[in-house]
Amino acid sequence: KEEQTTFRDCAEIFKSGLTTSGIYTLTFPNSTEEIKAYCDMDVGGGGWTVIQHREDGSVDFQRTWKEYKEGFGSPLGEYWLGNEFVSQLTGQHRYVLKIQLKDWEGNEAHSLYDHFYLAGEESNYRIHLTGLTGTAGKISSISQPGSDFSTKDSDNDKCICKCSQMLSGGWWFDACGPSNLNGQYYPQKQNTNKFNGIKWYYWKGSGYSLKATTMMIRPADF
């Protein structure tokens, strides 16, 4: 049997026998275009494609629509994988989304959505989520129904303001909503009463800016 040489996601890589976490090359569905992603092969059985990670504020997340579309940062550290790749990938098969969060007091929590996909660019990469479970709040901190994606140069929110400019970062802003994992990074002891921080309201409440976040996806049938 011929060995698979291209992989659409980290689940395929894991199933091929490569079970060490790290950076791998993925291929866009129905294309030869490639993208580098961090694969988490340890959490909850492995096979997770990391689509966002924050940990130290080393990467500026106040980026343009094009940058969020194509991705930025380093898969070994802070990065955004890219809306176009995630949209194409999640449009092909059913994916789950796991969001892992860390606060500054040493606590960890997660939210798991049993179905996640992004619409195409023509629909502003609108997020679709169902089936929330986990420890980071019984209510979804990503507004439901899902919002369009907005950036500093593409305002698609439901606010009289421009949420991306007011809060910083590209996100599925509502008006502006209970979350923004791409907000301004604040260090410990400077992370409360923040209007533009890394927010997940239904876990840590208002104005609390988190220490670390990871968004990762995996096929539902993994």
Epitope: C159, I160, C161, M166, A175, P178, F195, K199
Partner: nanobody
């Protein structure tokens, strides 16, 4: 650094009055709405009143309409809540909180709780019968 400090709470008899103050620093009231919230033991935090200086708008919960009055002093960067005809059911910890004034949904006048990102530590109000 954004800070909100409440004061003016205390113990008062039913029918009495109190004036709460919320002193804001690190931002100016012109660009923000300030809300007063309260939380009684074992209950959810609830909105009491809100003021938006940019257009002079005020909001009151039905339970306090006609009894409470919200106002602001821009020179002192302070918001006040005058509470008259107090009832035992007004007993709670009272908090003030701030939200950027523009963070409003199209067609709406006021803000969900999760939009208020800066909070004070609270002041206790106890109304005895």
């Amino acid at each position: 650094e954004v800070q909100l400090v409440e004061s003016g709470g205390g113990l008062v008899q039913a029918g009495g009055s109190l004036r709460l103050s919320c002193a804001a620093s690190g931002f100016t009231l012109d660009d923000y709405a300030i809300g007063w919230f309260r939380q009684a033991p074992g209950k959810e935090r609830e909105g009491v009143s809100c003021i938006r200086d940019s257009d002079g708008s005020t909001y009151y919960a039905d339970s306090v309409k006609g009894r409470f009055t919200i106002s602001s002093d821009n020179d002192k960067n302070t918001v006040y809540l005058q509470m008259n005809s107090l009832k035992p059911e007004d007993t709670a910890v009272y908090y003030c909180a701030a939200v950027p004034a523009g963070r409003l949904r199209f067609g709406e006048q006021w803000y969900p709780l999760y939009e208020y990102d800066a909070w004070g530590q609270g002041t206790q109000v106890t109304v005895s019968s």
